[in-house]
Every structure is written in C-alpha cells, then in structure tokens.
Interface confidence: medium
C-alpha cells in the first residue's frame, strides 16, 4: 500500500495473507468459514511451493493470539483466468478446515448486486504489499482509502486504454494506491467487499495508471457455485 497508514490491529478480521513457503505473497479475503478469495495470478507466482493462508494477523512476524496458519485443501482459479491478461483474476482457496472465528477472524459480506460503485465513493484497500517504490515491505497491515474512478475515465487512451471491462473497477492512484504484494486483497466500500486487487505488473501511485480491481458482484454465480 502506497501513501497509506498502519491499519488498526485486527479491525479487518476478514483480511488474509496468502503465503508460499511461509512468505507473504498476496492478500486475500475470508468470504466464508472455509474459503478465502484472492487473485488468480497469485498462484502463478507460487510455482510449486506450499500455499498456506494466514488469518487473524496484524503483524506478519510477531506472535499474536488470533493468528493461525491454514493449509489449503483446494485452489480454484477462475476457469477463464489467463497468465497474459488480468481478466477474471479471481482465485478461491478452500482451507483445510473451517476457520476458527472470533473478533479477529470473520468473513466479509460480498456484493451480489451487479451494479457499479458510484464514482467518488471512498473505498478501503488493505494489505502487506510494498509501501515504497524502493520495495520496502511492511510487517504490519497497512490500509488506504481510495476514491472510485469511473470506467470511462479509467479507459482513456492515456490511462488504461480500453482494457477495463464491465467486470472490473478502478480507483484513483494519485500518490495513494495498492501495489505489489497487495494483489488478491479486498477493496471494501461501505463495509461490503466490492473488489479484489488485480495482480498485474501495473506501476503504482501514478495518476495515469489507476488501480484495477475485479468486481466480485460480476462473479457472484461462479463464487456461489464453488462455495456450494
């Protein structure tokens, strides 16, 4: 997260760290007791490493009573996701067992109504991604509030040049932005999960390249079918 600040500890109990061989790789969001939603591209970076999900964490390194690392029983990328595109960049991870819920571990309601968030709405994005262009990684969860940007503006030739589909949304990226390591994390508007940080190699914090988020409402049928 660029230009953000440290999150209040455990105030986002849905927040997950998707880890490979014990290292944070991507963000994720607990959407059901046994399921974490993340970005499909995160799996590509996992290679053959052991994928696990950390829940109940604020600090990645310090012991915390609520922290628990779960093995992954099943990884379900969206069937249409492809390595060369950010389309359908969603991944569902089934935990080896139901998460132990509590004040610091709780699923987040996700948007099912397939309607665009009003441009200008401030949405919260959180993650353990880099906090500087030099690549500094935080130990504690960071967050930032970003105004949603309308799709037409986001699709301007000088910005994303038509790449933003109806199944994606954008947020402003002027100094404050999601970045490498935040992919798969939640974009929360009004207490509801609206978007998932896409995992392309987009430049961060540059107004000309707004943040791109996969709209979960557009994938309600797929999410329901996997969770069923």
């Amino acid at each position: 997260i660029l230009g953000g600040r440290e999150a209040e500890a455990h105030a986002r109990p849905y927040m997950a760290s998707v880890q490979v061989n014990g290292e944070h790789l991507c963000g994720g969001v607990l959407v059901a007791e046994q399921w974490v939603l993340s970005a499909a591209h995160c799996l590509e970076d996992a290679a053959d490493g052991k994928v696990q999900v950390l829940l109940g964490a604020h600090s990645l390194s310090q012991p915390e009573p609520s922290k628990r690392l779960y093995d992954v029983l099943r990884a379900v990328p969206h069937p249409d996701s492809r390595p060369d595109t950010i389309d359908h960049d969603l991944l569902l991870l089934q935990l080896s067992e139901k998460a132990t819920l509590g004040p610091a571990v709780r699923p987040l309601p996700w948007q099912r109504v397939d309607r665009d968030v009003e441009p200008g709405t401030l949405c919260d994005v959180a993650g353990w991604g880099i906090v500087s262009h030099a690549g500094r990684r935080p130990d504690r969860l960071q967050h930032v509030l970003l105004p949603v940007l309308d799709r037409a503006t986001c699709n301007r030739r000088t910005h994303h040049d038509g790449a933003i589909t109806q199944r994606m949304m954008c947020a402003e990226s002027n100094r404050r932005d999601s970045c490498k390591g935040d992919s798969g994390g939640p974009l929360v508007c009004g207490g509801v999960l609206e978007g998932v940080v896409t995992s392309g190699s987009r430049v961060c914090g540059n107004r000309k390249k707004p943040g791109i988020y996969t709209r979960v409402a557009s994938y309600a049928a797929w999410i329901d079918s996997v969770l069923a």
Partner: antibody, heavy 118, light 107 residues
Framework: EIQLQQTGPELVKPGASVKISCKAS????????ILWVKQSHGKSLEWIGN????????SYNLKFKGKATLTVDKSSSTAYMQLNSLTSEDSAVYYC???????????WGQGTSVTVSS | DIVMTQSHKFMSTSVGDRVSITCKAS??????VAWYQQKPGQSPKLLIY???TRHTGVPDRFTGSGSGTDFTLTINNVQSEDLADYFC?????????FGGGTTLEIK
C-alpha cells in the same frame, strides 16, 4: 501561500446565467480537486459538485445537475462554475474549496455572493 | 443521500469551559467526516478530517472523535475567538453532505 481567489459579488436578473471564477495559487492545480459549495441564508452548506482538473472529471449533486456546470482552465489554474436559469432560490454565497479528494475542503475561497433580483 | 444531523442548533458556553458538538450520520460513514469552523462574515475553515485528524495549524484544544454514525467535536478551554458556526461533513460517498450547523455562543 495557498489561495483561492473568487470573483466579486454578482447581481443578476431572474432567468439569466452567471459564471463564477476561482483562481488557485500556491500549489499544483492539477494535484487537487476543486469543490463548490452553496451557503444560503448564512447558515446551511450544500455540496454542489467537484471537478478534478487532472482528469477533467466532474461529480455533481443531483440537486444541482443542470443548474451548475463546472469547468477548469488548467493554463490559468482557474476553476469556473456557471449557474443557469437563475431564480431567487439561487441567491446565496457560493464557495470554491480545494480538496485532495480524501477529505473535505482544506482551503476555501472568500465566497461569491450571488443575488437574483429583477 | 446520507443525512448529517447536528441536533443542537445553538450551544452556549463560557470561556475556559469544555464543549462537545455532536453530529449523527444516517448511515455508516466510517471515519470519513470533517469538521469546519465558520466565523461571522468568513469562509469555512477545516478543523478536523478523518473524524479525528487535526488540520495544519489548528490548536490542539480542538479534538474530533467517533466512527460509524456518531461523531463529536470537542473544544477544550473555550476561547472567545471560538464563537462561530461549526459544521460536520461526510465524504464517504456522493453526494457529500453537511450537517445543519451548530452556533457556539460565548456567555
């Protein structure tokens, strides 16, 4: 020093239009949005809309859509608000303010009084 | 639209006292709330944003608190120059909306 300098008071006839300007100085104009606010009877504040000079992107309060038109001239770091088809209900003080979009207005113009009278 | 309600139109206090001005949002706005002070004949001035962060140059007598739907601006050790109208504003979602204002009177 950050300043937003607005045009002086306007006395206009019903049905006419008025264009208020807001000249920004002391900061990079395209780094911040400009918001416009109406204050009637010296009390309540109403948000009219925002314009983002970088994207040329506007957001309006539906109540003022069609009544107010927001524009900017980046070369002179000036924001404009045109008010159309004026009635006595539009008599008020109008403020422009700077905002970085992540909170309200941090610097305000001195206000422009618009009086609609025949 | 989100309605911001300042239940007290007027509040009376004495120099040196502490006063709390409240604002209630009709729905959850998180901490996306600002407070403004407007002295007679002047433009509004930003005091507090993100519910509790003081704007540059604002005396630490002014404190903001709250989240969700209930917000408070507290002025400690009230000074005569604090005579003004105080407005809350939410910027969580469009349209941005203001409270009706509270006039602080100094006895």
């Amino acid at each position: 020093e950050i300043q937003l300098q607005q045009t002086g008071p306007e006395l206009v006839k019903p049905g006419a239009s008025v264009k208020i300007s807001c000249k920004a100085s002391g900061y990079s104009f395209t780094d911040y949005i400009i918001l416009w606010v109406k204050q009637s009877h010296g009390k309540s504040l109403e948000w009219i809309g925002n314009i983002n000079p970088y994207y040329d992107y506007t957001s309006y309060n539906l109540k003022f859509k069609g009544k107010a038109t927001l524009t900017v001239d980046k070369s002179s770091s000036t924001a404009y608000m045109q008010l159309n088809s004026l009635t006595s209900e539009d008599s008020a003080v109008y403020y422009c303010a700077r905002s970085d979009g992540y909170y309200g207005g941090d610097y305000w113009g001195q206000g422009t009084s618009v009086t609609v009278s025949s | 639209d989100i309605v911001m309600t300042q239940s007290h139109k007027f509040m009376s206090t004495s120099v040196g006292d502490r006063v709390s001005i409240t604002c209630k949002a009709s729905q959850d706005v998180g901490t996306a709330v600002a407070w403004y002070q407007q002295k007679p004949g002047q433009s509004p001035k930003l005091l507090i944003y993100w519910a509790s962060t003081r704007h540059t140059g604002v005396p630490d007598r002014f404190t903001g608190s709250g989240s969700g739907t209930d917000f408070t601006l507290t002025i400690n050790n009230v000074q005569s120059e604090d005579l003004a109208d105080y407005f809350c504003q939410q910027y969580s979602s469009y349209p941005w909306t203001f409270g009706g204002g509270t006039t602080l009177e100094i006895k």
